[in-house]
């Protein structure tokens, strides 16, 4: 014979548990219905009546099946260094993440507590490791045959153009300058532009500015803490 289906509220079997999306009410000593996400328990169940649910009010939410008497308050509006990546609805809290050009230096359970600007790489240095939502940019000196003439949180070292006749040799912070015959661009290894980091997804690389006057001397960087940057721009 098919098992009898119990409708809430009902008394569980001795030592038994309530079913999925039900909870045991200590006062009524019955298995009662939980409320769905976006709702809360307006009236708790009794021995003869089931839980009465009601919708969450504006700016409040419940994300799970529940029997809470009040919905949770959504977090405060996102601060100026953050963007809202998930809106406050009756079923989910607002989530704020760091805006492009920033990374999360101190996270919290949902979203970010403190955003910091990504540091930038100066002319003569390129991005070795792009910034992410939770990590800063790492720069490296441009290797021989490559250069970067921008101060940027996204630009890598690019290969010097190859000239038939060189007018001015390139260095770490300046491209080679050719005489009038058309140059070709060398395909040095690692010359591919890094993908935009998550934290700079809406940025774009601006046109390359005039060559910088920064020295092209290469030297090793100490691995240490580093900061952030806003965009990919030249001095």
């Amino acid at each position: 014979l098919p098992a009898q289906v119990a409708f809430t509220p009902y008394a569980p079997e001795p030592g038994g548990t309530c079913r999925l999306r039900e909870y045991y009410d200590q006062t009524a000593q019955m298995c009662c219905s939980k409320c769905p996400p976006g709702q809360h328990a307006k009236v708790f169940c009794t021995k003869t009546s089931d839980t009465v649910c009601d919708s969450c009010e504006d700016s409040t939410y419940t994300q799970l099946w529940n029997w809470v008497p009040e919905c949770l308050s959504c977090g405060s509006r996102c601060s100026s260094d953050q963007v809202e990546t998930q809106a406050c609805t009756r079923e989910q809290n607002r989530i704020c993440t760091c805006r492009p050009g920033w990374y999360c230096a101190l996270s919290k359970q949902e979203g970010c507590r403190l955003c910091a600007q990504l540091r930038k790489c100066r002319p003569g240095f390129g991005v070795a490791r792009p910034g992410t939502e939770t990590s800063d940019v790492v720069c490296k000196p441009c290797a021989p045959g490559t250069f970067s003439n921008t101060t940027s949180s996204t630009d890598i070292c690019r290969p010097h153009q190859i000239c038939h006749v060189v007018a001015i040799p390139g260095n770490a912070s300046m491209d080679a300058v050719c005489t009038s015959t058309s140059p070709t661009r060398s395909m040095a290894p690692g010359a591919v532009h890094l993908p935009q980091p998550v934290s700079t997804r809406s940025q774009h690389t601006q046109p390359t500015p005039a060559p910088s006057t920064a020295p092209g001397t290469s030297f090793l960087l100490p691995v240490g803490p580093s900061p952030p940057a806003e965009g990919s721009t030249g001095d």
């Epitope: 910091a116 100066r122 900061p227």
Partner: antibody
């Protein structure tokens, strides 16, 4: 690379005042600019910042009292309605210290010499 | 709001002695902390950034340390030229901020 403030003077309460920070040797499309003030005999007080993209942010106490805008080589701080409590030396400072191939935007360097604003009736 | 509490407000030191200045953040600031020196009538000068890295040309007698919410500036072998007011500054300009600077510590050299 340097910054210099100008526009400080004696004004009566309620008279709007605009201070200007003129930068040289670097681009405002690469570095942020902060405004900081110091009342006579008091400590440094951060007012606000204009980021490279033109977005501004202010200290909680300064919101609505100041605005910051920029051109290609200058950054203006406007005090909407000065009170005697706004009497101070006003500094602009670049957000970004250059070191070891990096620009560290969380440190302020260089600073201008400051410009004195006196608000008195 | 993120608040920086700097102590002491004033400290006296003998030439050759050691001075310790403390800065406490109301929550972790992940080493995004700088120290400045300001002498009367002058603009502030950046001494240390990222909690412990000395800027170019600053004497190694200055040392920054700390992490999380607690940071310290130590001046060893104090000299007369060190008489100044010192400020800590957190590096978060985009958050709920009252003031990025601590209240300052005046160092008087005897």
């Amino acid at each position: 690379q340097s910054v210099e403030e100008s526009g400080g003077r004696l004004v009566t309460p309620g008279t709007p005042l605009t201070l200007t920070c003129t930068v040289s040797g670097f681009s405002l499309s690469t570095y942020d600019i902060n405004w900081v003030r110091q009342a006579p005999g008091k400590g440094l007080e951060w007012i606000g910042i204009i980021y490279t993209g033109g977005i501004t942010n202010f200290a909680n106490w300064a919101k609505g009292r100041f605005t910051i805008s920029k051109t290609s080589t200058t950054v203006d701080l406007k005090i909407a309605s000065p009170t005697t409590e706004d009497t101070a030396t006003y500094f602009c400072a670049r957000g970004g210290y250059d070191s070891d191939g990096y620009v560290y935007p969380d440190a302020f360097d260089p600073w201008g010499p400051g410009t004195l604003v006196t608000v008195s009736s | 709001a993120l608040v920086m509490t700097q102590t002491p407000a004033s400290v006296e030191a003998d030439v050759g002695g050691t001075v310790t200045i403390n800065c406490q953040a109301s929550e972790s600031i992940s080493n995004l902390l700088a120290w400045y020196q300001q002498k009367p009538g002058q603009r502030p000068k950046l001494l240390i950034y990222r909690a412990s890295i000395l800027t170019s040309g600053v004497s190694s007698r200055f040392k920054g340390s700390g992490s999380g919410t607690e940071y310290t500036l130590t001046i060893n072998g104090v000299q007369c030229a060190d008489a100044a007011t010192y400020y800590c500054q957190h590096g978060y300009t985009g958050t709920n901020v009252q003031n990025v600077f601590g209240g300052g510590t005046e160092v008087v050299v005897k």
